[in-house]
């Protein structure tokens, strides 16, 4: 039987000669467990593993800790790839994180973090970021230093409230902080003055809910 090639991320897929956008099967580091991920082979040279996408409100992002751990949605559409996979892969080598944003007026912007990784589940998948560049604000809309991940059934934020219940969605909430890309999806003309929407404060401010978001990772040495 022909031996199957194992890919740890979309950068490995790209380097193997598969350079078309689409869904590929990736394998967890040091494991045989597999996950389906969308690979962006065009943006900034390709090789990006998409870990989150919002585009139309078709998927409910008010999910449990376990669902955010293993992932949900459809990799070709709205989805969350899964905190456990992202933790494992970003602890193998240095990764960059690119966050691409769209507003309802046809504008696009991005934030690029030159070093990104998650802590493990025992540390609540705490986010670690360094070196921000990009057009979506000079200040990071993910609070620094990074916070623990919170969901509707796991309150790890710094607010007396439960941010995930107040603002909806799982995120690295502060108290509750300047971003939540997993908030409620609001259609055009209903997207302003929505404090529980898809927020990236240092680009669009407090009450603006975005049209689209993509979070993607790639090895720093790609």
């Amino acid at each position: 039987k022909e031996e199957q090639i194992i890919y740890r991320d979309c950068a490995e897929v790209f380097k193997s000669g598969l350079t078309t956008n689409g869904i590929y099967t990736l394998t967890f580091p040091n494991s045989t467990e597999e996950i389906k991920a969308y690979c962006d082979m065009e943006t900034s040279g390709g090789g990006w593993t998409v870990i989150q996408r919002r585009e139309d409100g078709s998927v409910d992002f008010q999910r449990t800790w376990k669902e955010y751990k293993v992932g949900f949605g459809n990799p070709s559409g709205e989805h969350w790839l899964g905190n456990e996979f992202v933790f494992q892969v970003t602890n193998q080598q240095p990764y960059v994180l690119k966050i691409h944003l769209k507003d309802w007026e046809g504008n696009e912007a991005y934030s690029l973090y030159e070093h990104f990784y998650l802590s493990g589940e025992e540390l609540n998948y705490r986010i670690h970021l360094k070196g921000l560049t990009g057009t979506a604000g000079k200040i990071s809309s993910i609070s620094q230093p990074g916070n623990d991940f919170s969901t509707k059934d796991a309150d790890n934020d710094k607010c007396i409230c439960k941010c995930s219940q107040m603002l909806t969605g799982g995120w690295w909430f502060d108290a509750c902080g300047p971003s939540n890309l997993n908030g409620m999806y609001y259609p055009q003309r209903q997207n302003t003055n929505k404090f529980n929407g898809i927020k990236w404060y240092y680009w669009k401010g407090s009450g603006y809910s975005l049209k689209g978001t993509t979070m993607m990772i790639r090895p720093a040495d790609f």
Epitope: I160, C161, K162, Q165, M166, A175, C176, G177, P178, N193, K194, F195, K199, Y201, K204, G205, S206, G207, Y208
Partner: antibody, heavy 121, light 107 residues
Framework: QVQLVQSGAEVKKPGASVKVSCKAS????????MVWVRQAPGQGLEWMGY????????GYNQKFEGRVTMTTDTSTSTAYMELRSLRSDDTAVYYC??????????????WGQGTLVTVSS | DIQMTQSPSSVSASVGDRVTITCKAS??????VAWYQQKPGKAPKLLIY???TRDTGVPSRFSGSGSGTDFTLTISSLQPEDFATYYC?????????FGGGTKVEIK
């Protein structure tokens, strides 16, 4: 200490406009959203809208949309609320208040002393 | 808009009395409720936020409770300076709204 000082009382004719100011001191002006709340004589409190001094972003209560404009001057740490096409039922005390958070419009921890606007022909 | 229905609209009480004011939201507001005290001719003053957290400097005789749609402000032992009007405020949903107020008067 943290305080908000508002401009003095105004008497206006119906159809006119009024611009109320609110000067902040004792904290970093751009770190907190500012809201405007009004109170008609003997009545309750009514939220008019907010402004984020950091980026100028605003959100208005639909009831006042098109008639109200909120602005700030960060060089003087002053917020302004202009209400146009005044009617007699706009007679009220207008308050500015600071929200406890930059990123959300939640509860209001510091209030100005209020500005009485009387609309009368 | 979410309606905040406060009751009673007024209450007569004596110094030392326990006073309870309730506020009912027309839909679930989680714990996103604040309480303010207002004296005649003065601006409102924040007492409680997140339904039960006292603001800095607020005496311990003031307490708040509740979640969802039903909220309570309690003054455990009324003091002379507590005679005022009290307002609840929801900030869970846009636009923020206030209750109609409860006037606490001297009996």
């Amino acid at each position: 200490q943290v305080q908000l000082v508002q401009s003095g009382a105004e008497v206006k004719k119906p159809g006119a406009s009024v611009k109320v100011s609110c000067k902040a001191s004792g904290y970093s002006f751009t770190d907190y959203n500012m809201v405007w709340v009004r109170q008609a004589p003997g009545q309750g409190l009514e939220w008019m809208g907010y402004i984020d001094p950091y980026n100028g972003g605003t959100g208005y209560n639909q009831k006042f949309e098109g008639r109200v404009t909120m602005t700030t001057d960060t060089s003087t740490s002053t917020a302004y609320m202009e209400l146009r096409s005044l009617r007699s039922d706009d007679t009220a005390v207008y308050y500015c208040a600071r929200t406890r958070d930059r990123y959300d419009v939640w509860y209001f921890d510091v209030w100005g002393q209020g500005t009485l606007v009387t609309v009368s022909s | 808009d979410i309606q905040m229905t406060q009751s009673p609209s007024s209450v007569s009480a004596s110094v030392g009395d326990r006073v309870t004011i309730t506020c009912k939201a027309s839909q679930d507001v989680y714990i996103a409720v604040a309480w303010y005290q207002q004296k005649p001719g003065k601006a409102p003053k924040l007492l409680i936020y997140w339904a039960s957290t006292r603001d800095t400097g607020v005496p311990s005789r003031f307490s708040g409770s509740g979640s969802g749609t039903d909220f309570t402000l309690t003054i455990s032992s009324l003091q002379p300076e507590d005679f005022a009007t009290y307002y609840c405020h929801q900030y869970s949903s846009y636009p923020p709204t206030f209750g109609g107020g409860t006037k606490v008067e001297i009996k």
